[in-house]
């Protein structure tokens, strides 16, 4: 047996992080996002749960809704009606999937200072929102959409087709929620509140995933979810628009699907209102390399929405799939005709384009060997966007302003030089027409949120600077974080290395690779974090590395689309390449290298362990995908095509973890999964375990009863990280 090695950080003034610190969330940070209610006014929920109104220009602030009112119904969230007469209070939050939840809603009348009685809302509600003007309410209850002209009125029932696990109106089914919309809702008000657009998802023919939920009863419950796996029948989707001014005078009007899309299986991908009587729908072929953006207009004389062919814009990828993770959405100009959109340029970098008539005639607005990430706001004279251009670091985000009123348009980086060392990764929140905006910096230093003037970009005030966190970290020995790149052949890989305090290049350290590696993901980001791997570096003296290999985002399509139709190959190869490079650096103990990952990262870590290279002593896979046939159609097929003989079945079969069961013989493998994982089904780990048993390969496993993909209940999470820590320390011969 190798003697145990104990890592002792030197210097006694500061203490190392403990696992308890991480599990208790002792060093979590705060951000401040204003809830904008006008060009210069916003709301914010205070620490003590008062809802406070702020006017930037008059400097006025007052409590609009007291914490006692919130407490009276146990409210955890709120929403002010645009006419400022009512507030909805949300309570009894009950999580469903990643974004979806149900809740009880109460309407509080700010004028009268009392709750609205009469025609109270049913419970639990699946989604509720105010119209953009006035105080109309749209809500979804039992998969049907209802409308109230005012909170105290009886509702109009807009849809009647809703049925549990069959037909969903105004809310997505499982696969659309997780893989397409990334929202809990599928309804959108027109800007003036006249129309309400919504999607109907018909899941009647979708196969059901069923799993046991053990609970406390004598018999387990069975959870049934319509869940299309790769190649299975998909939801049938239709988009309708209802005139909410006269809901019984005109029924919901269906929006036609573009012919080139409707000719085979397709997806709805997003809806954007352009003006009060113009809407933009985005559609995607099931083979997700063709996207169509369709602009439709209301024809009052026909009571119909017309989507002329000359208002269809096609986006196609010849090297992979359309878009990044999702197809980007358009940001329309004031003229309600032209728009700005991010898509790949001729060099394969995602950039902002201006489309006036056809995509072919698009004018490229940004260019370079970097990528535009997101368009925040388009005003009369400015376009605000984020990119990773600055200093050539793909893992940074800065906010830029293009003055589109000028000819030629001029570009300015709003954030690049604000707090250069502390802040390299920003997002922003703009008031309606960008008169003011908040910047939220996520790191690499302590996060800070600030308020700015939209015309001059001047900082007006600091909204949150995490002073308490700064103070509590003063006596903590934090590891050193480096973000660098390594080259191999013609490829460049960015990596983040977390080095133990008092790191000494002349010594040898155990190495843990943390991997995600999914298509269009990014792990190497200039953000602040104090988490499990921070603790491992700080207290246990482990070097941590994260590497963005091929298939990861924001470095051009050549790098991104390298994994198209062959998942599980280059992602793994690039992690192995990086490990070899790290060994060459001289401070890694080759005998003590591990890899771990969750979800897609669990898949990659499993394949890396089974690569037969002998690089890894041990590794952990949490909730891994084990075969792309077991995962959701929209995701799997986006990157792998269909699991059919005439398409890509061969690689679906070749890329499973099970196919490599024999290769786990010489590594220590810890396999972990929640039994109530609605996303990456327990089936994935069950099949890995079965294959390992059949191959007579020893391994360790842990399941978490009734836990989902996040294994996030307090007790389970504590157990999980404690268990993984023990496993790693044992693997690295670190004493407890």
């Amino acid at each position: 047996l190798r003697p145990s090695r104990v890592y002792k950080p030197e210097g006694n003034t500061k203490r190392a992080l403990t696992l308890k610190d991480i599990l208790n969330g002792t060093f979590s940070y705060k951000t401040y996002f204003p809830n904008w209610i006008s060009e210069q006014e916003y709301l914010h929920q205070s620490e003590d749960d008062n809802i406070v109104f702020y006017n930037i220009e008059t400097r006025e602030s007052y409590i609009i809704l007291s914490n006692s009112t919130m407490k009276s119904v146990n409210a955890t969230d709120y929403g002010l009606s645009p006419d400022r007469q009512f507030v909805y209070l949300e309570s009894d939050y009950s999580k469903l999937w990643r974004y979806s939840y149900t809740a009880t809603y109460y309407i509080y009348d700010l004028q009268n200072g009392e709750f609205v009685r009469g025609y109270e809302l049913p419970r639990p509600i699946q989604y509720l929102c105010w119209s953009p003007v006035g105080s109309k309410l749209a809500y979804v209850y039992q998969n049907n959409i209802y409308l109230k002209q005012r909170p105290g009125d009886p509702p109009f029932q807009i849809t009647y087709t809703g049925r549990e696990n069959r037909i969903f109106n105004g809310i997505p089914d499982w696969v659309y929620e997780e893989e397409m919309l990334a929202t809990k809702y599928a309804l959108w008000w027109s800007p003036d509140g006249k129309f309400l657009a919504y999607v109907e998802f018909n899941d009647s023919d979708i196969p059901i995933i069923a799993y046991s939920y053990y609970g406390d009863g004598q018999y387990p419950r069975t959870i049934n979810i319509p869940y299309p796996k790769a190649g299975a029948k998909n939801p049938v989707v239709r988009v309708f628009i209802v005139d909410t001014t006269y809901p019984h005078h005109v029924g919901p009007m269906e929006v036609p699907v573009p012919e080139m899309i409707a000719s085979s299986d397709y997806y709805f991908s997003w809806l954007t209102w352009v003006s009060s009587e113009r809407v933009c729908l985005q559609w995607l072929k099931r083979v997700q390399n063709v996207s169509v953006l369709s602009i439709c207009d209301f024809r009052e004389d026909w009571h119909a929405w017309e989507c002329p062919k000359n208002q269809e814009h096609v986006e196609e990828s010849r090297t992979g799939w359309a878009g990044g993770f999702f197809v980007s959405t358009p940001a329309f100009s004031q003229d309600a005709t032209s728009y700005y959109k991010i898509f790949s340029d001729k060099d394969g970098y995602k950039h902002i384009h201006y489309i006036k008539d056809t995509v072919e005639n698009a004018i490229q607005i940004t260019s370079g060997k970097w990528e535009a990430i997101y368009i925040f706001r388009v005003t009369q004279d400015s376009l605000f966007y984020s990119s990773n251009e600055f200093e050539g670091y793909p893992g940074r985000r800065n906010i830029y302003r293009i003055s589109i009123g000028n000819s030629p348009p001029s570009k300015k980086c709003v954030t690049c030089h604000l707090r250069k060392e502390r802040c390299q990764y920003y997002t922003a929140s703009f008031s309606y027409k960008a008169k003011y905006y908040a910047l939220v910096c996520y790191g690499p230093g302590l996060p800070i949120s600030t308020l700015h003037d939209g015309r001059t970009d001047q900082e007006i005030q600091v909204l949150e600077e995490n002073k308490e966190l700064e103070n509590s970290l003063r006596n903590i020995q934090l590891p050193k974080v480096e973000i660098k790149k390594l080259k191999d052949g013609g490829l460049t890989f960015w990596y983040k290395m977390i080095l133990p305090p008092q790191f000494d290049r002349s010594k040898k350290y155990p190495l843990l690779i943390q991997v995600y590696g999914g298509p269009c993901s990014q792990s190497v980001k200039s953000v602040f974090a104090v988490n499990w791997i921070t603790y491992l570096a700080s207290k246990e003296g482990i070097v941590i590395a994260l590497v963005d290999g091929r298939g990861t985002a924001f470095q051009g399509d050549k790098f991104l689309h390298a994994v198209y139709r062959k998942l599980g190959v280059y992602e793994v190869e690039d992690q192995l390449t990086a490990v070899r490079k790290f060994i060459e650096m001289g401070f890694i103990d080759e005998e003590r290298i591990a890899i771990w990952g969750w979800s897609y990262g669990g898949y990659v870590s499993s394949l890396a362990l089974a690569s037969g290279t002998g690089l890894f002593k041990c590794g952990i896979a949490v909730a891994p995908v084990s075969s792309w046939e077991y995962y959701a159609s929209i995701y799997s097929e986006r990157f792998m095509g269909l699991p059919t003989k005439d398409d890509n079945l061969e690689h679906y079969k070749n890329s499973t973890v099970m196919a490599r069961a024999e290769y786990f013989r010489n590594v220590d493998y810890l396999l972990i999964h929640g039994t109530a994982d609605d996303n990456v089904h327990f089936q994935n780990s069950a099949q890995i375990a079965k294959a390992l048993v059949n191959a007579q390969v020893d391994f360790q496993a842990m399941w978490y009863s009734d836990q989902n993909h996040g294994i996030s209940s307090g007790r389970s999470q504590n157990h999980l990280y404690t268990h993984m820590t023990h496993f790693l320390k044992q693997c690295f011969s670190l004493s407890d």
Partner: antibody, heavy 125, light 107 residues
Framework: QMQLVQSGAEVKKPGASVTVSCRAS????????IHWVRQAPGQGFQWMGW????????HHAQDFQGRVAMTRDMSTDTVYMELTSLRSDDTAVYYC??????????????????WGQGTLVTVSS | DIQMTQSPSSVSASVGDRVTITCRAS??????LAWYQQKPGKAPKLLIY???SLQSGVPSRFSGSGSGTDFTLTISSLQPEDFATYYC?????????FGQGTKVEIK
């Protein structure tokens, strides 16, 4: 007082067309939808469609697709309903009725509060 | 489309009786229901809107109740002029639909 006055009875042959008028008085004509409803002998009511006099926009029931046309004349505060390709089962009393909800506001249904006296249309060969 | 079903189709009653007519919607319509009275050879007259609101000028012996799918029109004390046919109408969703009618006759 508010009233709707309809044109007189009509006898038509199958395949022909009929136009029924409905003149409004005693209120602001543009502010209220006018609906057309028919009642076959000894039967209940069948809703046919509506016109928004303010905009001239119409909408009708699926059953009358392509056969019914509703128009209005703002100068005389009159709406017209034309039914084409008449069949014997179109024999009925045709009513115009005012919708109490306002065309200019978010919709609340208060009912059809003012009705015309009815126009008997007989379709017979 | 939503169907409206009234019951009974006819009722015989005497002056002073309490008469109840029910109307059932094939799907929920909240409170978007109106009641009409029609006498032979005449146009209908609006009695009740929004399920329970009395139209102005209508005697208070008429009342409406219900929400969702089940609704009731009650005449608390039948008067000679109340002998007529009564119709319900839904206005929750397109197209508006009427019940088939309930005839109140003299016993």
């Amino acid at each position: 007082q508010m009233q709707l006055v309809q044109s007189g009875a009509e006898v038509k042959k199958p395949g022909a067309s009929v136009t029924v008028s409905c003149r409004a008085s005693g209120y602001s004509f543009a502010d209220h939808f006018i609906h057309w409803v028919r009642q076959a002998p000894g039967q209940g009511f069948q809703w046919m469609g509506w016109i928004n006099p303010n905009r001239g926009v119409t909408h009708h029931a699926q059953d009358f697709q392509g056969r019914v046309a509703m128009t209005r004349d703002m100068s005389t505060d009159t709406v017209y309903m034309e039914l084409t390709s008449l069949r014997s089962d179109d024999t009925a009393v045709y009513y115009c009725a005012r919708d109490e909800s306002l065309t200019a506001r978010p919709y609340y249904f208060y009912g059809f509060d003012v009705w015309g006296q009815g126009t008997l249309v007989t379709v017979s060969s | 489309d939503i169907q409206m079903t009234q019951s009974p189709s006819s009722v015989s009653a005497s002056v002073g009786d309490r008469v109840t007519i029910t109307c059932r919607a094939s799907q929920g319509i909240s409170s978007w229901l109106a009641w009409y009275q029609q006498k032979p050879g005449k146009a209908p007259k609006l009695l009740i809107y929004a399920a329970s609101s009395l139209q102005s000028g209508v005697p208070s012996r008429f009342s409406g109740s219900g929400s969702g799918t089940d609704f009731t029109l009650t005449i608390s004390s039948l008067q000679p002029e109340d002998f007529a046919t009564y119709y319900c109408q839904q206005a929750n969703s397109f197209p508006p639909a009427f019940g088939q009618g309930t005839k109140v006759e003299i016993k």
